[in-house]
């Protein structure tokens, strides 16, 4: 008995070959002897029932001249899994068709961190093995149900599942979209008083995007976090529901999600967590955002530079007179110079690769007051 594997919804070709390699009479039947189709000597395909009943069954007329009389079954259904009989040249060929189906749990659009379950449906009597490969090369294998926990952004794309039965295989491709922000975290460095732009680009595109979101903010100086803004998303259009009075954030009306803080102030420095709940999805998308604020001031005979917010312990804060060596450099959040000489002073926040933030302050001769450009 020949075995053919098929995929639900696709086509299968069941072979039937003549030894004479020329056109001959043949008939395809179900195992209960009901006729499906055949050719009775006139080179015409004759179906065994009403067109509506047998419109999924066909043969390859072009192959008949070569002595090949396949049965083509289109739009395969699970119930097509059975034995088919090809009668030709006073012999009967039995062909077993097994139709398989691999589906993803409920939805192919899943949130980052959620689980993906892939389920194999197979005909009674079959004992297939299945292995699925993620777009990033992760292999999972097992029985009829395969699970991947903690989906990551790199898991977005085409998953390939190979079903193996009696040394024959059939391959399924399932497109999975992992819903996430492009970046898990970002840091914005600003001088006091500058406008701050926060952007939250998504790592996926869908036709319609509906949901609601909120930005919670933990200021470095505050004892608890507070909600800065809540918003709705309807068909990719953003509308603000509620915003705090201090600070009064502005939000862009289109994607990507975009927030503007009118000015960076020390009391706003800290970390935020933007959450986005999507319609018909359990769980939320998250993106962390951090704000570091720098202030340079001169009070009487003391020139001070300070930073607020979540900085790496490797960052260096320096005060230097323009075009001169740094007067003071510390891996701390505040530096100062007593009795600074007149000129343009620079406060610099640096790491190993660049100056992240710079603020200039002009120190006038002692009889004048300072000017901040």
């Amino acid at each position: 008995k020949t075995l053919v594997l098929g995929k639900e919804g696709e086509s299968a070709e069941l072979p039937c070959e003549s030894s004479q390699k020329k056109i001959t009479v043949f008939t395809w039947k179900f195992s209960d002897q009901r006729k499906i189709l055949g050719q009775h000597g006139k080179g015409v395909l004759i179906r065994g029932g009403s067109p509506s009943q047998f419109d999924r069954f066909d043969s390859k007329k072009g192959a008949w001249e070569k002595g090949s009389f396949p049965l083509i079954i289109n739009k395969l259904k699970m119930e097509d899994s059975q034995t088919y009989i090809c009668e030709l040249e006073n012999r009967k060929e039995e062909v077993e068709l097994w139709v398989f189906k691999v589906t993803a749990n409920s939805d192919t659009h899943l949130l980052q961190g959620q689980s993906l379950t892939l389920t194999l449906e197979s005909p009674p009597g079959s004992s297939p093995s299945v292995q699925c490969r993620s777009p990033r090369g992760k292999n999972i294998q097992g029985g009829k149900t395969l699970s991947v926990s903690q989906l990551e952004l790199q898991d977005s794309g085409t998953w390939t599942c190979t079903v193996l039965q009696n040394q024959k295989k059939v391959e399924f491709k399932i497109d999975i979209v992992v819903l996430a922000f492009q970046k898990a975290s970002s840091i914005v460095y600003k001088k006091e008083g500058e406008q701050v732009e926060f952007s939250f680009p998504l790592a996926f595109t869908v036709e319609k995007l509906t949901g609601s979101g909120e930005l919670w903010w933990q200021a470095e100086r505050a004892s608890s976090s507070k909600s800065w803004i809540t918003f709705d998303l309807k068909n990719k259009e953003v509308s603000v529901k509620r915003v705090t009075q201090d600070p009064k954030l502005q939000m862009g009306k289109k994607l990507p999600l975009h927030l503007t803080l009118p000015q960076a102030l020390p009391q706003y420095a800290g970390s935020g967590n933007l959450t986005l709940a999507l319609e018909a999805k359990t769980g939320k998308l998250h993106q962390e955002v951090n704000l570091v604020v720098m202030r340079a001031t001169q009070l009487q005979k003391n020139l001070t530079c300070e930073v607020w917010g979540p900085t790496s312990p490797k960052l260096m804060l320096s005060l230097k007179l323009e075009n001169k060596e740094a007067k003071v450099s510390k891996r701390e959040k505040a530096v100062w110079v007593l009795n600074p000489e007149a000129g343009m002073w620079q406060c610099l926040l640096s790491d190993s690769g660049q100056v992240l933030l710079e603020s200039n302050i002009k120190v006038l001769p002692t009889w004048s007051t300072p000017v901040q450009p």
Epitope: S186, L315, G353
Partner: antibody
């Protein structure tokens, strides 16, 4: 093509000094933090030192402070490691590496040289 | 200085296996951790930076996770070219420190 090539290794007696060089091509050392990392025969990697993009800051492994000095010459696009009072434990392959720093948050050594071998032996 | 403890020190596995290497910091390093691969006679190669960011050109079977003091490198399906020594590096603060390494061998 971004590349780092170390030189200056060799056999040296204990207590003596040696200066290693690392020539950079395809980028400028004055735009990146630059590291030295070493590996004793059959042992793991040991971080040695870093010099910042502007040369303003230098940091060393605790055990090497005062013995080794990291420096660079921007005009020659070259990194150096001056090693004084060498001991048998300083026998190793010395690698230089470039550090990428993004947003004051993401740091990584993405380009490494092939290494130069220093053997301290009496 | 921050101490990094890597485990196991050696590991035998087969092609196709899923492998996990862990690294523990002696204090909180947030997510200041990278993973490097080294083959005999060669310079180290960056795989993962800032705990979970995959370096460009590195196969996606490599992934990193963790935060604070406990970190993990996972190779989802071992390939013949993955047999090497792996090091974690804390770059949260100076002086930087490497883990002692994990030698991944063919079973």
């Amino acid at each position: 093509q971004v590349q780092l090539v170390e030189s200056g290794g060799g056999v040296v007696q204990p207590g003596r000094s040696l200066r290693l060089s690392c020539a950079a091509s395809g980028f400028t050392v004055s735009s990146y933090g630059m590291h030295w990392v070493r590996q004793a025969p059959g042992k793991g990697l040991e971080w040695v030192a870093i010099i910042w993009f502007d040369g303003s800051n230098k940091y060393y492994a605790d055990s090497l402070t005062g013995l080794f000095t990291i420096s660079r010459d921007s005009s020659k696009n070259t990194l150096f490691l001056q090693m004084n009072s060498l001991s048998l434990e300083d026998t190793a392959v010395y690698y230089c590496a470039r550090e990428v720093a993004l947003e004051g948050y993401y740091y990584y050594m993405d380009v490494w040289g092939k290494g130069t071998t220093v053997t301290v032996s009496s | 200085a921050i101490q990094m403890t890597q485990s196991p020190s050696s590991l035998s596995a087969s092609v196709g296996d899923r492998v996990t290497i862990t690294c523990r910091a002696s204090q909180d390093i947030r997510n200041g951790l990278g993973w490097y691969q080294q083959k005999p006679g060669k310079a180290p190669k960056l795989l993962i930076y800032t705990t979970s960011s995959l370096q460009t050109g590195v196969p996606s079977r490599f992934s990193g996770s963790g935060s604070g003091t406990d970190f993990t490198l996972t190779i989802s399906s071992l390939q013949p070219e993955d047999f090497a020594t792996y090091y974690c590096l804390q770059d949260y603060n100076y002086p930087y420190t490497f883990g002692q390494g994990t030698k991944l061998e063919i079973k």
